[in-house]
Interface confidence: low
């Protein structure tokens, strides 16, 4: 007699380890013999899928090698055309020993920064992650924490954090260890003992002392007035990550001697500098507020504007003065492409002479600022329209960068050529050609042949600007 299908052994939850075999049994009584189909998460399992074996007229479903993605609800459905189809469902829970999917890697980090050693794991039940430093379990503290992901985060890395680390992933099925990795803590170069300034008699010997530390141990170089030391002897010793350098000099002229300690962090360098002056008794007194050196201009942007082989002031508040000042000019120069033909050469002359100021190479190299009258000539005569537009943009916050402000002088703060003609630099490009007041003669020397006629003084200025904006 025909009999509707009945499932005599309902499906149950099956636990299986990754790469092991898992079997679901769906025993059915019926007549005629039923057709049995299987689904996973409501998607039909195809009979020809080689990852599965379906036997006993469809009553046995075997997963031949369980993967972690096989998790889900499996159902068998039996139908023989008599009565309705019947269904039974059960879950497959894939159990997995811990596995480290993203192991930690060697890390070099600069002291004070944040270090993260990755350790991403897989496993069911979810593994717990701990860390070992050296031979001991790592204890979490205010700076050290194991994140939800298993990664180790160390805030404000200190020298003592350096060492060998490994992560450990553990669940009820087993334990996995990562390979040992190294955390190296690097420390910026720092000068421990700066060279001292000396005032000596002509022809004496002086020893300048400079001590520095860092990880890796820095190298020390000595600079004399902006150039590599050409004479004198240097003795160095290294002990306990401290380098000690002594420069012995025979003094025949005053100079500014800079000790530069440099160490390398990946592709970047860290540099610490300390300077000392060696003056000769009865030579002129050094000025103390200028930090820089005189050097021939060797850039490109201002080649046509500055005098050939001009001696310019390079500001050592930049790590790389020559490049920093050149890039500063370059950035501002690009903005000058759009200004009027009258303004452009004047603005270029002002820009180059402001960023690369003429340098007086005394005991302490001194920059010579542009004369106020020339600055005002650019501002109020040649580039009045553009200057106003720039101030307006600054006022309305349209400039995203402060960089252009560095390349625009404050005219009112510059010395007047009427106070002391030698205390400020003139801009030859701005000196009028009497036949044609709008031309800029080619530069033949750094001194103008004609004084600028009727230059507006700051008092007769056609407009003024609040000092809040450093454009005046």
């Amino acid at each position: 007699l025909p009999k509707a299908p009945v499932i005599t052994t309902p499906l149950e939850t099956v636990d299986a380890l990754v790469e092991e075999v898992a079997t679901f049994m769906c025993a059915v009584e019926s007549y005629p013999q039923p057709e049995i189909s299987w689904t996973r998460n409501k998607i039909l399992i195809k009979l020809f899928d080689t990852r599965y074996s379906i036997r006993e007229n469809g009553q046995l479903l075997t997963i031949l090698s369980v993967e972690d993605s096989d998790d889900g609800i499996y159902c068998c459905t039996a139908n023989n055309g008599v009565g309705g189809a019947v269904e039974s469902c059960g879950a497959l829970q894939v159990k997995m020993k811990p596995k480290i999917t993203r192991p930690p890697i060697n890390v070099k980090i600069i002291e004070g920064l944040k270090a993260v050693l990755p350790c991403t794991t897989m496993g069911n039940p979810k593994p717990s992650v701990s860390w070992i430093k050296g031979d001991s379990p790592l204890r979490e503290n205010s700076r050290t924490a194991v994140l939800e992901s298993g990664s180790l985060r160390i805030h404000n890395v200190q020298k003592e954090d350096a060492g060998q680390y490994r992560c450990v992933a553990k669940n009820s099925l087993g334990t996995a260890y990562s390979k040992v990795v190294k955390l190296e803590v690097e420390v910026f170069a720092r000068i421990l003992r700066a060279p001292e300034s000396h005032n000596v008699t002509f022809g004496s010997f002086v020893t300048l002392h400079c001590t520095a530390t860092g990880i890796p141990v820095p190298t020390i170089t000595w600079i004399e007035n902006g150039n590599a030391v050409s004479s004198g002897s240097i003795q160095e010793s290294v002990k306990d990550r401290v380098i000690d350098s002594r420069l012995q000099l025979f003094i025949t002229k005053p100079g500014l001697y800079t000790c530069i300690a440099t160490n390398k962090h990946g592709e970047k360098f860290s540099t610490a500098k300390a300077a000392a002056t060696v003056s000769i008794a009865e030579w002129s007194k050094p000025q103390k507020d200028n930090k820089g050196y005189c050097a021939q201009y060797r850039g490109e942007v201002c080649n046509a504007v500055l005098a050939k082989d001009a001696l310019v002031f390079l500001n050592t508040s930049y790590a790389d003065p020559e490049e920093a000042q050149e890039l500063l000019v370059h950035t501002a120069w690009n903005e000058l492409k759009v200004v009027s033909p009258l303004c452009r050469p004047a603005a270029e002359a002002l820009l180059c002479n402001h960023v690369f100021q003429e340098c007086s190479p005394g005991v302490v190299p001194t920059p010579i600022p542009i004369c106020r009258e020339y600055c005002l000539a650019v501002k109020e005569l040649f580039c009045a329209k553009e200057w106003l537009a720039m101030e307006e943009k600054t006022h309305r916050g349209l400039y995203r960068s402060e960089m252009h402000l560095l390349s625009v002088p404050e005219c009112s703060k510059l010395p007047s050529m009427h106070w002391d003609p030698t205390a400020c630099a003139r801009l030859p490009h701005l000196d009028y050609n009497k036949e044609n007041p709008k031309t800029f003669p080619p530069m033949t020397s750094s001194k103008p042949s004609v004084d600028i006629p009727n230059l507006p003084s700051s008092s007769s200025s056609s407009f003024s600007v609040s000092p809040t904006y450093s454009m005046t």
Epitope: A228, E267, F269, T271, R298, G299, E300, V301, N303, A319, D320, E322, E323, E326, L327, H330, W333, N334, K337
Partner: antibody, heavy 121, light 112 residues
Framework: ELQLVESGGGLVQPGGSLRLSCAAS????????MSWVRQAPGKGLEWVSA????????YYKESVKGRFTISRDNAKKTLYLQMNSLKSEDTAVYYC??????????????WGQGTLVTVSS | QAVVTQEPSLSVSPGGTVTLTCGLS?????????PDWYQQTPGQAPRTLIY???SRHSGVPSRFSGSISGNKAALTITGAQPEDEADYYC????????????FGGGTKLTVL
């Protein structure tokens, strides 16, 4: 006489590494920026990387960023190019070139004879 | 990203004048791109001819000159010689970031 002599080229498999060196003589090495320029067989020149006089900053062509590292040892008067994760398209003659000033982007005013790098399996 | 464009090939008669140009796929070449020109003969390393638009490198004959004309950089050879037959490359400074310095594809110059 100013001379730039490259070395370190050769045959390497894809994914491999090479370190090129450029020994400089006849000029004050630490006064000038330096560059690497390459030329694939039968193709044009291609700027690869640059470094200023003091190694304080580095510049790279986009396609080599993260794989190539330029460095210099001023005491040894040597420029280096460490090339990792090499690809077949990195096959080229690599020229070391001197810049006209300290900055990294000055004109190239002196060239070495080049060293051939072949990346092939 | 801007591409530096050059004529693939040009020819000139001995003693004649020829101008090679160097442009940008997007925009104009200006003095702020500091155009440089290099010459390369087969099997040889490149040689610097002109740097920063119009400065002749030492030892370069005066028949080579550089300029910016319209929206392109130009290399002019006045009174071409047979030994001027070579590949000529221009290179432009493109500002900060990546690909700071970009070469053109080169111009093959034939002196017929």
């Amino acid at each position: 006489e100013l001379q730039l002599v490259e070395s370190g080229g050769g045959l390497v498999q894809p994914g491999g590494s090479l370190r090129l060196s450029c020994a400089a003589s006849g000029f004050t090495f630490d006064d000038y920026g330096m560059s690497w320029v390459r030329q694939a067989p039968g193709k044009g020149l291609e700027w690869v990387s640059a470094i200023p006089w003091n190694g304080g900053s580095t510049y790279y062509k986009e396609s080599v960023k993260g794989r190539f590292t330029i460095s210099r040892d001023n005491a040894k008067k040597t420029l280096y190019l460490q090339m990792n994760s090499l690809k077949s398209e990195d096959t080229a003659v690599y020229y070391c070139a001197k810049r006209s000033g300290r900055i990294a982007f000055g004109a190239l005013d002196a060239w070495g004879q080049g060293t051939l790098v072949t990346v092939s399996s | 990203q801007a591409v530096v464009t050059q004529e693939p090939s040009l020819s000139v008669s001995p003693g004649g004048t020829v101008t090679l140009t160097c442009g940008l796929s997007s925009g104009s070449v200006t003095s702020s791109n500091y155009p440089d020109w290099y010459q390369q003969t087969p099997g040889q390393a490149p040689r610097t001819l002109i740097y920063t638009t119009n400065s002749r490198h030492s030892g370069v004959p005066s028949r080579f000159s550089g300029s910016i004309s319209g929206n392109k950089a130009a290399l002019t050879i006045t009174g071409a010689q047979p030994e001027d037959e070579a590949d000529y490359y221009c290179a432009l400074y493109m500002g900060g970031g990546s690909n700071v310095y970009v070469f053109g594809g080169g111009t093959k110059l034939t002196v017929l």
